[in-house]
Interface confidence: low
């Protein structure tokens, strides 16, 4: 007996071939011997089966001795043995229809779980293997679960259902709702304007929700809500904003905040959360601000950084075009009685300069100049 696998909602064509290459009488029946369709001369006739409005054949092939049964919009309950009677012969075809669906919305928040459920006909024992967009393979039976979805899981999941050494492939598009980056860090000199951006890693026609940015300044004992906002059809409206700092928020995506000046008291880390309409849970992005200040007080040239720096970062003070005078894995370095000239304060990571501030030291009778 021939086995054919079909997908729920799809169309399947079951073949039936006569030895004579001409139009002769044929009938398709189900396992209960109920007629589905057949012919009467050149006319297609239909029986009383429940497939009535979804069954068809290709009249153009009858003259070649081919009498296919076409079933549209397949349902799981269409799984059956179909019998083609032609030339006193019977050809049996077993049709098995499978369906694969995501348990919930196919738009899921980062960190949530995805469950794929296989619908299969009674008596079948299929195996399922799914491949995620990042190439991860998951195997299972009637259900497959993936916990802690990551951004790389966004895209087309390809699932193969195997039964009777035949296979059928399903494709399910999953969108993981997340920010493009889980964390970002901004390095600024004192007084510079700061731009924070929170680009989303997905695009949808309508995007509605609300969000806020809580900020933990390094110098503060507790975190503070800097800004709260609404997002309606991808347009941003600010609800509340702290008086200090005087933040500005862009009216359009990507979510974009401007801090007029980087000051030591603002250095620290923030957490932007975005709650999307009709979704449980929130999207999160961490943002960090590191601020540098170079100063000269009397005979002391000091360079300091504030904010979340890694222990492997190096802070150096050097006179232009000379070797570093002082270089430490600390948040402050200084030089006593610095010689006149342009001094550079550098924050670097493995030789790569992240932040640089210049200060001009004048001969001792003058005051310093910051370019």
């Amino acid at each position: 007996k021939k086995v054919v696998l079909g997908k729920k909602g799809d169309t399947v064509e079951l073949t039936c071939t006569a030895s004579q290459k001409k139009s002769i009488q044929f009938h398709w029946k189900n396992s209960n011997q109920i007629k589905i369709l057949g012919n009467q001369g050149s006319f297609l006739t239909k029986g009383p089966s429940k497939l009535n409005d979804r069954a068809d054949s290709r009249r153009s092939l009858w003259d070649q001795g081919n009498f296919p049964l076409i079933i549209k919009n397949l349902k799981i309950e269409d799984s059956d043995t179909y019998i083609c009677e032609v030339e006193d012969q019977k050809e049996e075809v077993q049709l098995l229809v499978f369906g694969l669906t995501a348990n919930s919305d196919t738009h899921l928040l980062q960190g949530q779980s995805l469950t794929l459920t296989l619908e299969s006909p009674p008596g079948s024992s299929p195996s399922v293997q799914c491949r995620s967009p990042r190439g991860k393979n998951i195997q299972g039976g009637k259900t497959l679960s993936v916990s802690q979805l990551e951004l790389q899981d966004s895209g087309t999941w390809t699932c193969t259902v195997l039964q009777n050494q035949k296979k059928v492939e399903f494709k399910i598009d999953i969108v993981v709702l997340a920010f493009q980056k889980a964390s970002s860090i901004v390095y600024k000199k004192e007084g510079e304007q700061v731009e924070f951006s929170f680009p989303l890693a997905f695009t949808v026609e309508k995007l509605t929700g609300s969000g806020e940015l809580w900020w933990q300044a390094e110098r503060a004992s507790s975190s503070k809500s800097w800004i709260t906002f609404d997002l309606k059809n991808k347009e941003v409206s600010v609800k509340r904003v702290t008086q200090d700092p005087k933040l500005q928020m862009g009216k359009k995506l990507p979510l974009h905040l401007t801090l007029p000046q980087a000051l030591p008291q603002y250095a620290g880390s923030g957490n932007l959360t975005l709650a999307l309409e009709a979704k449980t849970g929130k999207l999160h992005q961490e943002v960090n601000l590191v601020v540098m200040r170079a100063t000269q007080l009397q005979k002391n040239l000091t360079c300091e950084v504030w904010g979340p720096t890694s222990p492997k970062l190096m802070l150096s003070l050097k006179l232009e075009n000379k070797e570093a005078k002082v270089s430490k894995r600390e948040k402050a370095v200084w030089v006593l009685n610095p010689e006149a000239g342009m001094w550079q304060c550098l924050l670097s990571d493995s030789g790569q300069v992240l932040l640089e501030s210049n200060i001009k030291v004048l001969p001792t009778w003058s005051t310093p100049v910051q370019p």
């Epitope: 493009q180 980056k181 970002s184 731009e195 924070f196 951006s197 929170f198 680009p199 695009t203 026609e205 309508k206 309606k232 059809n233 991808k234 347009e235 009216k251 359009k252 995506l253 990507p254 974009h256």
Partner: antibody
Framework: EVQLVESGGGLVQPGRSLRLSCAAS????????MAWVRQAPGKGLEWVAT????????YYRDSVKGRFTISRDNSKNTLYLQMNSLRAEDTAVYYC?????????????WGQGTLVTVSS | DIQLTQSPSSLSASVGDRVTITCRAS??????????MQWYQQKPGKAPKLLIY???NLASGVPSRFSGSGSGTDFTLTISSLQPEDFATYYC?????????FGQGTKLEIK
């Protein structure tokens, strides 16, 4: 199929007014920002104005601020540009465009344009 | 306002040629790691058509011979193998700041 059809262009004297319309179909009009972009004869493209999906936010280029008003009627799927105190330099083909975005905002569908000639 | 300067202003090429058009912004059009730059194609008497958004993303229905690259202030539109229907005027456009601005256009003609 997304369609944007402008109308209302024509010859008008300097200092007079004109109202352009843009009939939208084939998409959910109330979900999208809309814009007017113009092109003077033989010249490049110039953004004129943008309106948010619900009409609450509008932006204009400086040279038309106070003279032009962008508006929309979501119940009629129609975008408007009311042009007052018209000047010779406003002569152009006026395109209505849909604004979409991924990170930046861009004009993903355009109408065929309507010509406005300001001349005495 | 952010000024966009395209080069060349006009260009003659043959079918099958690889063509590159550049667009330079007077200031960065990046926000964080995003480059807010678009490219459009316009044929005589017709409305512009979106080709590329966000510097390198290909708009729906646009052939893969078109590609965009660049970041910050310098951007490029490349047509890998010119087809007869590609002869048109090309514009870049930034949407980092209001007002949105376009380049002056590059006219691509048949050699």
């Amino acid at each position: 199929e997304v369609q944007l059809v402008e109308s209302g262009g024509g010859l008008v004297q300097p200092g007079r007014s004109l109202r352009l319309s843009c009939a939208a179909s084939g998409f959910t009009f109330s979900n999208y920002g809309m814009a007017w972009v113009r092109q003077a004869p033989g010249k490049g493209l110039e953004w004129v104005a943008t309106i948010s999906y619900d009409g609450s936010i509008t932006y204009y280029r400086d040279s038309v601020k106070g003279r032009f008003t962008i508006s929309r009627d979501n119940s009629k799927n129609t975008l408007y540009l009311q042009m007052n105190s018209l000047r010779a330099e406003d002569t152009a083909v006026y395109y209505c465009a849909r604004e979409e975005q991924y990170s930046s905002w861009y004009f993903d569908f355009w109408g065929q344009g309507t010509l406005v000639t300001v001349s005495s | 306002d952010i000024q966009l300067t395209q080069s060349p202003s006009s260009l003659s090429a043959s079918v099958g040629d690889r063509v590159t058009i550049t667009c330079r912004a007077s200031q960065s059009v990046s926000i964080s790691s995003h480059d807010l730059m678009q490219w459009y194609q316009q044929k005589p008497g017709k409305a512009p058509k979106l080709l590329i958004y966000d510097a390198f993303n290909l708009a729906s229905g646009v052939p893969s011979r078109f590609s965009g690259s660049g970041s910050g202030t310098d951007f490029t539109l490349t047509i890998s193998s010119l087809q007869p229907e590609d002869f048109a005027t090309y514009y870049c456009q930034q949407s980092k700041d209001d007002p949105y601005t376009f380049g002056q256009g590059t006219k691509l003609e048949i050699k």
